[in-house]
Each structure stands twice: as C-alpha cells, then as structure tokens.
Amino acid sequence: YDFTNCDFQKIEADYLRTISKDLITYMSGTKSTDFNNTVSCSNRPHCLTEIQSLTFNPTPRCASLAKEMFARKTKATLALWCPGYSETQINATQAMKKRRKRKVTTNKCLEQVSQLLGLWRRFIRTLLKKQ
C-alpha cells in the first residue's frame, strides 16, 4: 500500500491521543535506552510503511503484536485516514487469523515495540531541528 495520500495530520493526532499511550503501556518497566535503533524511516509515507510492517507482519520471534490494543488502534487509524487502506488489508487479516499464537510478551516483542515507538517519533517529527 502507498501511504502518500494519507491525512498525516489526522494520523499524528490519533497517535498522540491514543496509540502512543498504548505503546508506552506495553513497554512499561522498560527503559527506552534498553534497545538500540535497528529500523528507521525517511519521510512520513516511509514511516507508515515501516510501522505497518513491524505492527502487522508476524516475525519468528514476535508473532502476536497484531492483536495488541495499539495495533488495533493503528489499523483503525490507517483505515480511517488512508484512502483505500482497508481494502488492501482484508486478505492480510484473513491470513493472520489462520495462524493465531498464544499471547506472550517476549523480550523480542518489547524490542520490536521499542522500534515502533522510534518510528512513530520520527513520523510526528516533520522536520529535523535544523538544517
């Protein structure tokens, strides 16, 4: 999906209002410095591409993020403010339901959510301080 035509201001508002709080709750008890940055993004559409990938694509070491509250809210936000996004996600959702796994907050999931927080922070920072 091409995120270029999303309403970035509305997505930013939703993130600051709800998604960020759910991410921080998930990470409670973990310092942000516990994990190094292993993923970045270079503009707002790119950030959303990487956020979608980390949030909804199961990985061998962290398969359950898509069922978390922050993921559900992320999905709703993207569906609301990115034209045509919900249609592209129907097949992906059906495939995900087939491979449900039990919910375990592993260290690798914490690391992945830490990376997600970093991506969201870059998304809401429209410009660097300077240059």
């Epitope: 292993t38 993004c41 270079s42 240059q131």
Partner: antibody, heavy 122, light 108 residues
Framework: QMQLVESGGGVVQPGRSLRLSCAAS????????MHWVRQAPGKGLEWVAV????????HYADSVKGRFTITRDNSKNTLNLQMNSLRAEDTAVYYC???????????????WGQGTMVTVSS | SYVLTQPPSVSVAPGQTARITCGGN??????VHWYQQKPGQAPVLVVY???DRPSWIPERFSGSNSGNTATLTISRGEAGDEADYYC???????????FGGGTKLTVL
C-alpha cells in the same frame, strides 16, 4: 548485534579499479542512508559518497565524482563502492557508515565498520 | 563549499574540563555531530544534533552550538579520553557531508 563489515581492500596500481563491499547485519538495512568515509594515513576523515535508503539518489565528494560509484542491494544487505581510475591520493582506510535520514537531510553516523585499507601504488 | 575549523590539539589535566571547538559560518543553524577516534580504530559517535548523547556515551561528554562555534565539552578528563575528535555537519545547500580537520586531545 548491529554490525558493518567492509571487504575488498588491497594494493592496486594507479589507473586500475577496485570494488569495496560492506555487509550489514543486526538492523533493517533498507531503512537507512549509507555512506563511505575515508581516512588517508595520518590524516583526518573525508566523506566520499552517500546513497539514499532506497537507492534512489547518490551524492559524491568532488574529489571522487565521475570515478567512484556507490550502490546498494537491499535484498542482500550490502553496500558497494566501485572505484575506477584510482590515484595515489585515494590511498586510505575506507569506512562504511550508517546514517538515518529525513527527506534529503542526513543525520549522524551512528554505526561504522572497522574499515578496509586501499593502497594505490605502482 | 562549507568549511569546519578545529584546533589541531587540545590538552587537559586529569579531572579537568576539556573544550574542543568547531568553527563554521553560522554553524548554529546546522546540527553538529561529534566523533571520537582512537588510534587504529573506527570513529565512534559521542554527541549528535549539537547536544544529544548516545545511550552508551558517559554524561561527561556534552555539546553546545550557537553563532559561529560549536563546542564539545569533556568534563573530568580521563586518560581513556585521549583520542582524535571530529565535528561534522550535513551541508544541505550542496548535499555534502563535511568534517572538521580533527583535534587531538591529550590528557596530561
């Protein structure tokens, strides 16, 4: 463990070519801008080239423009530097380095490789 | 093209504060990064975006930037701080990375 490992250095005659590679591991390579920086023996750091996270743009220092080409293969997590028409003044340790970027602005080099030595001599 | 000027050398007594400067035209309008390089090793980022510090760098390292001068400050200097230090900016007008000439820090 985030890591950059350079290879391909060696001794080469003036006018000849050499290809350096940099293997990335431990991070999502395709999301970072990547650079080559060199350091002549006993001298300071000199930036050589940059390639955008998606390979869509490249920029070069004037000293290597037209002779060096930076490329990347995001499917293999590798960065390359093709060096043609080498000169004695290209003798240096060559480092690859990662840098987050925002639009067309590059941020600090937060991870560096260990470097590979290139000696141009007849 | 944009030029960054550093003093070739700076000395500090153990336990004292060292300040390494980096001069450039209106450098305060740019984000400045600082690297430490010990002999035979690759550079290591010690301060980025003027004054931010990577999590693995001790609090003794700090930075500031305004006007035409950026400064790296190393408080309570130790023998292990002996190294070359380089400032760096991204010059967006020319799309080039620029390094200062480097400063050799000696802990007496």
């Amino acid at each position: 463990q985030m890591q950059l490992v350079e290879s391909g250095g060696g001794v080469v005659q003036p006018g000849r070519s050499l290809r350096l590679s940099c293997a990335a591991s431990g991070f999502t390579f395709r999301t970072y801008g990547m650079h080559w920086v060199r350091q002549a023996p006993g001298k300071g750091l000199e930036w050589v080239a940059v390639i955008w996270y998606d390979g869509s743009y490249t920029h070069y220092a004037d000293s290597v423009k037209g002779r060096f080409t930076i490329t990347r293969d995001n499917s293999k997590n590798t960065l390359n530097l093709q060096m043609n028409s080498l000169r004695a003044e290209d003798t240096a340790v060559y480092y690859c380095a990662r840098s987050p970027q925002w639009e067309d602005i590059f941020e600090a080099f937060d991870i560096w490789g260990q470097g590979t030595m290139v000696t141009v001599s007849s | 093209s944009y030029v960054l000027t550093q003093p070739p050398s700076v000395s500090v007594a153990p336990g004292q504060t060292a300040r390494i400067t980096c001069g450039g035209n209106n450098i305060g309008s740019k984000s400045v990064h600082w690297y430490q390089q010990k002999p035979g090793q690759a550079p290591v980022l010690v301060v980025y975006d003027d004054s931010d510090r990577p999590s693995w760098i001790p609090e003794r390292f700090s930075g500031s930037n305004s006007g035409n001068t950026a400064t790296l400050t190393i408080s309570r200097g130790e023998a292990g701080d002996e190294a070359d230090y380089y400032c760096q900016v991204w010059d967006s007008s020319s799309s080039l990375v620029v390094f200062g000439g480097g400063t050799k820090l000696t802990v007496l």
